[in-house]
Amino acid sequence: PTGAVEVQVPEDPVVALVGTDATLRCSFSPEPGFSLAQLNLIWQLTDTKQLVHSFTEGRDQGSAYANRTALFPDLLAQGNASLRLQRVRVADEGSFTCFVSIRDFGSAAVSLQVAAPYSKPSMTLEPNKDLRPGDTVTITCSSYRGYPEAEVFWQDGQGVPLTGNVTTSQMANEQGLFDVHSVLRVVLGANGTYSCLVRNPVLQQDAHGSVTITGQPMTFPPEA
């Protein structure tokens, strides 16, 4: 409709690391003579319309979301209705709606994508002694406390992908962070290096682990 307040948010999701603070940007264009007494601002969870934070009747009504949200009071009069979300958790991921009512009303939704980097993988071998070429071994690559679910890739020392006989499991802990365990069953050659890459698809962050088997004894590369 002509003259309706235009509410603007980023098109791309806001990416926030677990434990950090995130800013969900939202803005509107105040008309000349605008005062905060005219503003009614509601932040809510898009899906449920559950209240997150509000500014009504000329004042900040505070957080309705575990006391982890705040507005930018000094910037509201200029049309900055952004929301600060503190100590981001996995459970915060989703869509938030910024609803602005002045003379008329408008809304827009912004997505929050939560992420956490995966730890450097630890590598274990079973069996881990008296290995001979032709033996079948199980190599386990474990990486912890990442989000969202990882992509796991295996390759040999020549960089050739190893896709057969791989079993990957991912389990979420109480905080919603994932622990990844990927198991490669392989028949040993005379010697070889086996690498596991754990990729966080949101952060585009790769965590590498490798094990080298050179006859006897077997060696693990030093931790980076």
Partner: antibody
């Protein structure tokens, strides 16, 4: 249980105006958006505009801009829709329907409560 | 102008399952469109069945469910009853206004 009760049927002359009321009873959800929706004979539903009585702010569909005025009186829990410069094709049943701006229950039921409708006939 | 497309009519049998859809000219329907489904029977006021894409309004029977399928809003009726014969309208929210679809006439044979 919230109910929306609308004013009675109206017969109007072309060029005149009509004002329809919609009173909420049995408890209110605040803030709510009171929408006005019409249905001409044999036609579908058409959104005309809506108001948030708590804030006193209204929006209108482009088609009705300048011809419709939606107001509300918070003290009486009543919303009003006034349509001016009436034409014969404004003959329709006019409904009010409540939508939650904030779902206090944590569940968004949408336009869950409707008025019984007000028939407006425009005829010379 | 935003255009919304619904199947003009559908026919089903008692006890069957039927899915009505609602397509938007602006692209994929998302949760921020708060898809609503409204039932209208002759001589009666419309009745809100589903709000917020998939939330049943109080009094809506469990056989009605809302969802998003392939970028469209959808209403599925599982175990259709004779009393479900009606016109069903979808409504989508676009930032500051509602837009209604043209309606689907559901016939039960």
């Amino acid at each position: 249980q919230v109910q929306l009760v609308q004013s009675g049927a109206e017969v109007k002359k072309p060029g005149s105006s009509v004002k329809v009321s919609c009173k909420a009873s049995g408890g209110t959800v605040r803030p709510a958006l009171i929408n006005w929706v019409r249905q001409a004979p044999g036609q579908g539903l058409e959104w005309m505009g809506g108001i948030i009585p708590l804030f006193g702010t209204a929006n209108y569909a482009q088609k009705f801009q300048g011809r419709v005025t939606i107001t509300a009186d918070e003290s009486t829990s009543t919303a009003y829709m006034e349509l001016s410069s009436l034409r014969s094709d404004d003959t329709a049943v006019y409904y009010c329907a409540r939508d939650q701006v904030v779902a206090t229950s944590g569940v968004n039921f949408g336009m869950d409560v409707w008025g019984q409708g007000t028939t407006v006939t425009v005829s010379s | 102008d935003i255009q919304m497309t619904q199947e003009p009519s559908l026919t089903t049998s008692p006890g069957g399952t039927v899915t009505l859809t609602c397509r938007s000219s602006t692209g994929a329907v998302t949760t921020s469109n708060y898809a609503n489904w409204v039932q209208e029977k002759p001589g009666q006021a419309p009745r809100g069945l589903i709000g917020g894409t998939n939330k049943r309004a109080p009094g809506t029977p469990a056989r009605f469910s809302g969802s998003l399928i392939g970028g469209k809003a959808a209403l599925t009726i599982t175990g259709v009853q004779p009393e479900d014969e009606a016109i069903y309208f979808c409504a989508l929210w676009y930032s500051n206004l509602w837009v209604f679809g043209g309606g689907t006439k559901l016939e039960i044979k």
